[in-house]
């Protein structure tokens, strides 16, 4: 997934207490037992800092070595720093683990910018604020890297939660979540609530902030409001989905829906931005500019480079439009839409202006590898990765940042014909097509 532009975090959670849940529709109750309910021990188990990803605490080896690991639904390797590096406070020391097993195999992962390489092995892994299990999992011990680790990010490795097809060096290397499900009775499902800051955080706040929740094995009611809407996973490699329509403030971009998914659309927690194919990005920016034309912003702002600053507390959210993505539904000719606010796609940046100003980057950017629904999208929603039923669920997050006038939304159903035609069929080429990193 690696990295590029990552995201802000929120201090505390805005979710209602368990006794004050909104009434919800019951069409989800058909799910098998144990997959829904309360996962108190896992709530608030993610942290992170602005633009640098969300991480969970994990332990590896015997005796356990504690590391912070970036949660990445856009890759499939469990890889951890295993040698000294200027940006790492700690790293996995294989020689200190009595349960480490060397697979005598190397792995090399290049990105568009940067790379990591390492040695494959297996060891015992657990998640302290996760299910009470220990599993033997594949680990890539990173021995060399370039532009991979981020100075001050506080994470030392990456947990790739996608499917084996995109694992390196090949699909025979079982990803962590597959190992977890195989070796335990944990249901084949996890869910993510990423909580963006909505305001710039200083260093102290950022380090102390709660970033969200990764619920392993099910769905936690307290993390969302309203109902969950599901879109099929088109193919089990990345978490690939199909977008059938895009609107800016309710205005349809009116593009051939294939363009929205050219060459794929994925849900990726390891990418900060909402990334759109070139043609779609250009149309979206044109529409966002038109909607916000009472003010004009510099060219570099729309490129995600320049920061626009307003007097603290006076950011004119109302002049920026909402962005709606319509996703293929589970029923034929039915779709639903997810709508994000400028509070999601304008990313607060700290340390650039005076304390009297709030500064933001535009967090929608151009992609040459398809649509990437990164943290900008995910911070609005509770996202359920229902691998067992090959679908991804979206509901309004209990911690999303909004104002008194607008809120993020998940709404449906909408009648949409010929949705299958919206998917792009990638010509089969060699493995090198997977070598582009994500910004």
């Amino acid at each position: 997934t690696h990295l590029g532009i990552r995201l802000p975090l929120r201090s505390g959670l805005a979710g209602p207490p368990l006794g004050l849940r909104l009434p919800r529709e019951t069409d989800e109750e058909s799910e098998e037992p144990g997959r829904r309910g309360s996962f108190v021990e896992m709530v608030d188990n993610l942290r992170g800092k602005s633009g640098q990803g969300y991480y969970v605490e994990m332990t590896v080896g015997s005796p356990p070595q504690t590391l912070n690991i970036l949660v990445d639904t856009g890759s499939s390797n469990f890889a951890v720093g295993a040698a000294p590096h200027p940006f790492l406070h700690r790293y996995y020391q294989r020689q200190l683990s009595s349960t480490y097993r060397d697979l005598r195999k190397g792995v090399y992962v290049p990105y568009t910018q940067g790379k990591w390489e390492g040695e494959l092995g297996t060891d015992l892994v657990s998640i302290p604020h996760g299910p009470n299990v220990t599993v033997r999992a594949n680990i890539a011990a990173i021995t060399e890297s370039d532009k991979f680790f981020i100075n001050g990010s506080n994470w030392e490795g990456i947990l790739g939660l996608a499917y084996a097809e995109i694992a390196r060096p090949d699909d025979s290397l079982e990803p962590f979540f597959d190992s977890l499900v195989k070796q335990t009775h944990i249901p084949n499902i996890f869910s993510l609530q990423l909580c963006g800051a909505g305001f710039p955080l200083n260093q102290t706040e950022a380090l102390a902030s709660v970033g969200g929740s990764m619920i392993i094995g099910g769905i936690d009611h307290s993390l969302y409001t309203g109902r969950l809407w599901y879109t099929p996973i088109r193919r089990e490699w990345y978490y690939e989905v199909i977008i059938v329509r895009v609107e800016i403030n309710g205005q349809d971009l009116k593009m051939d829906c294939k363009e929205y998914n050219y060459d794929k659309s994925i849900v990726d927690s390891g990418t900060t931005n909402l990334r759109l194919p070139k043609k779609v990005f250009e149309a979206a920016v044109k529409s966002i500019k038109a909607a916000s034309s009472t003010e004009k912003f510099p060219d570099g702002f729309w490129l995600g480079e320049q920061l626009v600053c307003w007097q603290a507390g006076t950011t004119p959210w109302n002049i920026f439009p909402v962005i709606s993505l319509y996703l293929m539904g589970e029923v034929t000719n039915q779709s639903f839409r997810i709508t994000i606010l400028p509070q999601q796609y304008l990313r607060p940046v700290e340390d650039v202006a005076t304390s009297q100003d709030d500064c933001y980057k535009f967090a929608v950017s151009q992609s040459s590898t398809g649509t990437v629904m990164g943290a900008v999208i995910m911070e609005g929603f509770y996202v359920v990765f229902d691998r067992a039923r090959k679908r991804i669920g979206f509901a309004v997050s209990a911690c999303h940042v909004h104002d008194e006038f607008r809120t993020a939304a998940v709404e449906g159903p909408f009648v949409t014909a010929d949705m299958e035609d919206c998917g792009y069929n990638i010509p089969q080429t060699d493995e090198s097509t997977l070598m582009t990193g994500r910004a």
Partner: antibody, heavy 120, light 108 residues
Amino acid sequence: QLQLQESGPGLVKPSETLSLTCTVSGGSTSSSSYYWGWIRQPPGKGLEWIGSIYRSGSTYYNPSLRSRVTISVDTSKNQFSLKLSSVTAADTAVYYCARVGHGISYFDLWGRGTLVTVSS
Amino acid sequence: EIVLTQSPATLSLSPGERATLSCRASQSVSSYLAWYQQKPGQAPRLLIYDASNRATGIPARFSGSGSGTDFTLTISSLEPEDFAVYYCQQSLTWPPRTFGGGTKVEIK
């Protein structure tokens, strides 16, 4: 070609309000391509940005002056104006109006400037 | 807040010599940096924008370079009219607001 010209009193008493107008000729303050700004320079010192305005009236101010500054635009007269209240001797400076161009990121055209002295 | 530090404060050179002026940002401003020239009793004039692009009508002897935190304005061969004060300004944070303290280029 486009020109900017500042006008207003050269002497203002302490605690009063400094008022300046910038008249744009050879161009239009209603252009969607530009912001319009005020910058000042105390005698023998560096440049200090005061604030900027768009044709819609949308304004941005220097945080250190924000509580005292008002910038407005009158597109029908092709003018924009600066008001700085509760002035002190520290506000004595040459005041420049300028156009913000080149991707609205830089001050690409300036007026000649007008010296405003704050003194009783 | 991004702070721009210019050095040296004063540069004493003779006509025909090469002038190298430095502007350092307290954190990266990418390439969003401009240089202005101000002669005594005149308004500043934009010389260079986006770190290296010459503004309209600026002679080729003026060139800008750098990105991130370190920037340089070079005058390849000083003409008599080039003796002035030079300011840098960043616009990574918008609206453009921050100027450096200036470098005075004087005749030796």
